[in-house]
C-alpha cells in the first residue's frame, strides 16, 4: 500500500532544494501542477505552478522557485534556490483538477533551513539567473486562487531500517528520514 510520507531536508542559507514529485503519467501528464507550503493551522498556499496545460520539460520560474514538468516521465521537478531561513516549512506538490479538489502528490517535504555558510564549495548560490541560466518565464494561466481545505495531518513514523546512501555534504543526526542534499554551482 502507498504510504503518505514526509521527508526532511536540512539545508543552509544560500543552498538549493532540488526535489521531485511523481504522478500517474496517463492521468496527469498535461494537468497543471503546483508547489505549496503548508503552515501550521493554515490552508496550503500555492507558491508556484506550471502552465495550463503543463508544458513538457519547460522551466517555469517564480521568484526563487523553478518548476519543470517531465510529462514523458511523470515527474515534476522543484528547485528552490538561494534558500532563506524563512523558507523553512512543510511543502507539497499538487495537481489541479478543477472543479475537484487538488490531488496531492508524494512525498511531502519538510524543509529546515539554518543560518550559516555550509563550507561546501559552490553552496553560496545567490543569483538564480546565474546559477540556472533559465530565461525567466511567466505562467500564461495564473495559479488557481483556491487552496485545498484538506486538513494537515502528521505523517506516520517510518521504518528506521534504512541504510545510508552516498549523500555526505550535510551532517546527519540519527534521525533516519533527514535527507542530506548536495549543493551545486
Amino acid at each position: 500500500a502507498t504510504k503518505l510520507t514526509e521527508e526532511k531536508y536540512e539545508l543552509k542559507e544560500g543552498q538549493t532544494l532540488d526535489v521531485k514529485c511523481d504522478y500517474t503519467l496517463e492521468k496527469f501528464a498535461s494537468s497543471q501542477k503546483a508547489w505549496q507550503i503548508i503552515r501550521d493551522g493554515e490552508m496550503p498556499k500555492t507558491l508556484a505552478c506550471t502552465e495550463r496545460p503543463s508544458k513538457n520539460s519547460h522551466p517555469v520560474q517564480v521568484g526563487r522557485i523553478i518548476l519543470e514538468d517531465y510529462h514523458d516521465h511523470g515527474l515534476l521537478r522543484v528547485r528552490m534556490v538561494n534558500l532563506q531561513v524563512e523558507d523553512s516549512g512543510l511543502y507539497q506538490c499538487v495537481i489541479y483538477q478543477p472543479p475537484k479538489e487538488p490531488h496531492m502528490l508524494f512525498d511531502r517535504i519538510r524543509l529546515v533551513v539554518t543560518k550559516g555558510f555550509s563550507g561546501t564549495p559552490g553552496s553560496n548560490e545567490n543569483s538564480t539567473q546565474n546559477v540556472y541560466k533559465i530565461p525567466p518565464t511567466t505562467t500564461k494561466a495564473l495559479c488557481p486562487l483556491y487552496t485545498s481545505p484538506r486538513t494537515v495531518t502528521q505523517a506516520p513514523p517510518k521504518s528506521t531500517a534504512d541504510v545510508s546512501t552516498p549523500d555526505s555534504e550535510i551532517n546527519l543526526t540519527n534521525v533516519t528520514d533527514i535527507i542530506r542534499v548536495p549543493v551545486f554551482n
Epitope: T5, R77, F106, I179, F184
Partner: antibody, heavy 122, light 107 residues
Framework: QVQLVQSGAEVKKPGASVKVSCKAS????????INWVRQATGQGLEWMGW????????GSVQKFRGRVTMTRDTSIHIAYMELSSLRSEDTAVYYC???????????????WGRGTLVTVSS | DIQMTQSPSSLSASVGDRVTITCQAS??????LNWYQQKPGKAPKLLIY???NLETGVPSRFSGSGSGTDFTLTISSLQPEDFATYYC?????????FGQGTRLEIK
Amino acid sequence: QVQLVQSGAEVKKPGASVKVSCKASGYTFTRYDINWVRQATGQGLEWMGWMNPNSGNSGSVQKFRGRVTMTRDTSIHIAYMELSSLRSEDTAVYYCARGGYTSSWRWYFDLWGRGTLVTVSS
Amino acid sequence: DIQMTQSPSSLSASVGDRVTITCQASQDIRKHLNWYQQKPGKAPKLLIYDAANLETGVPSRFSGSGSGTDFTLTISSLQPEDFATYYCQHYANLPITFGQGTRLEIK
C-alpha cells in the same frame, strides 16, 4: 545484507514479452527509486526508466514507451520490468539499480543487481 | 537529450601510473555527474557522485572534478584491480544518459 537479486537468464522469440524481477533486501524498499539499465554485449549502459516503489508510478525513455511496464509488489519487496514486442536488438543484460530517495533529484545508482541476460532469437 | 562524450575510448597504462579520463557534456550540467566502474561480467559500481564525492568504500586514489560541461576522473596510482571500463552519467535533466565508456587496459 543490502542487495538486489535478479531473476535468471531468459531466451525469447521475436514478438514475445519478458518479465525480469528484482528483489530488494536490507533496506526500506519503498524509500528509494528502482531504475532499469540495459547493456547489449560489448556496448555501453542505457537507462530505460525508473519506478517509485511507494507510489507505483514509473516513467521510461521515449524509445521504450509503450513497450516497457514497471511494476512492484511491496509486500515481497520485488520490482518487475516487462518488455514486450521483443526484437533481436533487445538482446542485452538488464540491470535493476537503486536510485536516490524517492523525493530527491539524486539520480545516482549505488546498488545494482547482477543483471539478467535476455536473448531474443528465432 | 544531453550527450556525454568520454575520452579516450580506450587507454593502456601500467600499475602505478596516474590516469585521467575525461567526460564532456553537450550542455551545462553543473555538478550533476556520476562515475561508475564496470568489470567484465559484473554490474557497474558507483565510484564518484555529484562530480567530486567519493562513494563510501571506494579507495581514495579515485577522485573526480569538474563542473558545467567538463569533468575528470583521476586514478592517482593504478592498481591491478583498477583495469576495467569507466562510465560517466549525468542527471541534470531527463533522460539520464551515460558516456560511451573508457576501457582501461594493462600496458
